[in-house]
């Protein structure tokens, strides 16, 4: 075994054991886990006669190491005397001694509770120059105590704390009130608050919580759109500050990009939300080629408010690469709304979740607000899918009855396009190139939250409905049930309610 | 001691990257701070970096400069400089304890001009 | 923001006088103020940190005081060789700080 040394322990009887007319009183020092023998145990009894036994030492069995006990037993006016044994382990080292100063015997005693306080942030949410930590001590037996502060497990200039002691009836606390500069503070070191009493120890620590986004404020850092990169070729990024405070100084936003290249130059848009909030966009134009080539761009935002600038950066996706898979749907006609239908547009097995979803009619594309899209979920594969749905007006679909839903995606040949026609009434319809037969089943989403019916007659589905694979060349996300209709007469099938 | 690298002349929407690097003490184990002084002007505080990279700026500096820190430097990069930057570049140690600057490089000039 | 204002701008005395230059905090920042010395072409030299502990090597001729917002060094037997710029410095906070420098005091040596 290599050379250890010791550790000390005082023995002391507790002092409501001892009796009152004791006229003799026996203490002990136990020395243990040492390698290899002797240790040396003295005694300073002061002014008091004392006399002094070591055992022999024992082995301890799993270690091999070493055990010893020294006892002193003292008469006279031993009640408020303090006795120190001295334990050496030359071995160790030739000046390797701990000294254990204790009383004859231990009274009962409360512990104290150790708890660390912090002062709060100013007015205006923010750190004052300095931090306050405020360590209580509460609830102990009265008694000598010792607070230090330790920064890092390192101890504190003893100048930048104060403590104070008041005694509430039979028991006692202490507060030490530690001041620390912002600096401190924020230099994600741990304080300590490192309570000594009856030769035992009670601590606790604290430190700065890490700030992931200083005080609600979120920033964002889109992509460019696939409509925007491929189709317009002039793709832009976009930087969102949300949940500002609107104060003195600006928000600055600042572009980057890893490469050192250059920026082009940026517009920016402030918001003054219903909330009180600002909300603050940046947009930056990005060379098509410079995207696709996997160039990374940061935005950085900067605030004389914010502890610290908000960092985000944003690039081409990595991973996979999948095409999307088109399907568009017509809603049947819905009693009471005969000027009006709905299509919808089922968008999926794409990698990755960019993409852009438009409606053309008559080769044009319709605005944006006219129809809604969902965004990119995953499906229970790998890759993404969305939905989209566009109201039309017998107007519409009476002057020429094909839309189109197209979407944009990188990884759809040849032109990043993949489009699909659709008729509100597939039978009149002229069809085209495009059109495609509308299905032999109609795929509907199974979540049923609307409270929506099965079927239209009511919960229970039409006799001719069921539920079932149908085509096998028409294949749909796990996601969505199938309803197939027992097709009857010339029409190829019809709609007869809602799955 | 500290050092800071050779300052040179810049033009106007140029940028800057000034090294600080120390001998006879690690860096790693230390705060740092950058200061300027324009001539004839008093000092100004830019910023300065904890031990562990945590940054923290002078609220004039609105992201133009950057603090960052390696194992053996401590640089100050300087963007979208004018010619109200024109000035010398301290970096300087925080080493007592109580945050004041015991240590200081002799300091280097950039000139913002056309 | 936490600004300090550092008076006077100037100050003169004799060889042997005494001068007092204040600094002042907008801000509590307990002890955590320092004192600078500066001669042209040269760097800062730190004189005094901890508001009243002085840097090693520096004569006991100066002398820092206060804690709070109120600070004073004292510069007593001056000599010739003190004639330089005096600032005070805030260390403590880092956030939302113009300048955690005093605006200077030059001390002109008669």
């Known amino acids: 075994a290599s050379t250890q040394s010791p550790s000390v322990f005082p023995l002391t009887r507790c002092c409501k054991n001892i009796p009152s007319n004791a006229t003799s009183v026996t203490l002990g020092c136990l020395a243990t886990g040492y390698f290899p023998e002797p240790v040396m145990v003295t005694w300073d009894t002061g002014s008091l006669n004392g006399t002094t036994m070591t055992l022999p030492a024992t082995t301890l069995t799993l270690s091999g190491h070493y055990a010893t006990i020294s006892l002193l037993t003292v008469s006279g006016a031993w009640a408020k005397q303090m006795f120190t044994c001295r334990v050496a382990h030359t071995p160790s080292s030739t000046d390797w001694v701990d000294n254990k100063t204790f009383s004859v015997c231990s009274r009962d005693f409360t512990p104290p509770t150790v708890k660390i306080l912090q002062s709060s942030c100013d007015g205006g949410g923010h750190f004052p120059p300095t931090i306050q930590l405020l360590c209580l001590v509460s609830g102990y037996t009265p008694g000598t105590i010792n607070i230090t502060w330790l920064e890092d497990g390192q101890v504190m200039d003893v100048d930048l704390s104060t403590a104070s002691t008041t005694q509430e009836g039979e028991l006692a606390s202490t507060q030490s009130e530690l001041t620390l500069s912002q600096k401190h503070w924020l230099s994600d070191r741990t304080y300590t608050c490192q309570v000594t009493y009856q030769g035992h120890t009670f601590e606790d620590s604290t430190k700065k919580c890490a700030d992931s986004n200083p005080r609600g404020v979120s920033a964002y850092l889109s992509r460019p759109s696939p409509f925007d990169l491929f189709i317009r070729k002039s793709p832009t990024i976009t930087c969102l500050v949300v949940d500002l405070a609107p104060s003195k100084g600006t928000v600055n936003l600042t572009w980057s990009r890893a490469s050192g290249k250059p920026v082009n130059h940026s517009t920016r848009k402030e918001e003054k939300q219903r909330n009180g909030t600002l909300t603050v966009t940046s947009t930056l134009p990005v060379g098509t080629r410079d995207w696709i080539e996997g160039e990374t761009y940061q935005c950085r935002v900067t605030h004389p408010h914010l502890p610290r600038a908000l960092m985000r950066s944003t690039t081409k996706t990595s991973g996979p690469r999948a095409a999307p898979e088109v399907y568009a749907f017509a809603t049947p006609e819905w009693p009471g709304s005969r000027d009006k239908r709905t299509l919808a547009c089922l968008i999926q097995n794409f990698m990755p979740e960019d993409i852009s979803v438009q409606w053309l009619h008559n080769e044009v594309q319709l605005p944006d607000a006219r129809h809604s899209t969902t965004q990119p979920r995953k499906t229970k594969g790998s890759g993404f899918f969305v939905f989209s749905r566009l109201e039309v007006t017998r107007a519409e679909w009476e002057q020429k009855d094909e839309f189109i839903c197209r979407a944009v995606h990188e990884a759809a040949s040849p032109s990043q396009t993949v489009q699909r026609a659709v008729s509100v009434n597939p039978g009149l319809a002229g069809g085209s190139a495009q059109s495609q037969r509308a299905p032999d089943r109609v795929l509907c989403h199974s979540g049923q939250q609307q409270g929506l019916p099965r079927a239209a007659g009511g919960s229970v589905p039409h006799p001719r409905c069921h539920c079932g694979a149908g085509r096998a060349d028409w294949p749909g996300p796990p996601e969505l049930d199938v309803c197939v209709e027992e097709a009857e007469g010339e029409a190829p099938w019809t709609w007869t309610g809602l799955c | 001691s500290l050092g800071e690298s050779r300052g040179r002349l810049v033009t106007p929407g140029g940028s800057l990257t000034l090294t600080c690097t120390a001998s006879?003490?690690?860096?790693?184990?230390?705060?740092m701070g950058w200061v300027r002084q324009a001539p004839g002007k008093g000092l100004e505080y830019i910023g300065w970096?904890?031990?562990?990279?945590t940054t923290y700026y002078a609220s004039w500096v609105n992201s133009r400069f950057t603090i960052s820190r390696t194992s053996t430097t401590v640089d100050l990069e300087m963007t979208s400089l004018t010619t109200e930057d024109t000035a010398t570049y301290f970096c300087?140690?925080?080493?007592?304890?109580?945050?004041?600057?015991?240590?200081w490089g002799p300091g280097t000039l950039v000139t913002v001009s056309l | 923001a936490l600004v300090m204002t550092q008076t006077p701008a100037s100050v003169s005395a004799a060889v042997g006088g005494t001068v007092t230059i204040n600094c002042q905090a907008s801000?509590?920042?307990?002890?955590?103020l320092s004192w600078y010395q500066q001669k042209p072409g040269q760097p800062p030299k730190l004189l005094i940190y901890?508001?009243?502990t002085l840097a090693s090597g520096v004569p006991s001729r100066f002398k820092g005081s206060g804690s709070g917002t109120q600070f004073t060094l004292t510069i007593s037997d001056l000599e010739c060789d003190d004639a330089a710029t005096y600032y005070c410095?805030?260390?403590?906070?880092?956030?939302?700080?113009?300048?955690?420098f005093g605006g200077g005091t030059e001390v002109v040596v008669k």
């Open positions: 006879g003490f690690s860096l790693s184990s230390y705060a």
């Open positions: 970096i904890s031990a562990g990279g």
């Open positions: 410095q805030q260390d403590a906070a880092v956030i939302s700080i113009d300048n955690s």
């Open positions: 801000q509590s920042i307990h002890k955590y």
């Open positions: 300087a140690r925080e080493g007592t304890g109580w945050g004041a600057y015991d240590i």
């Open positions: 901890r508001a009243s």
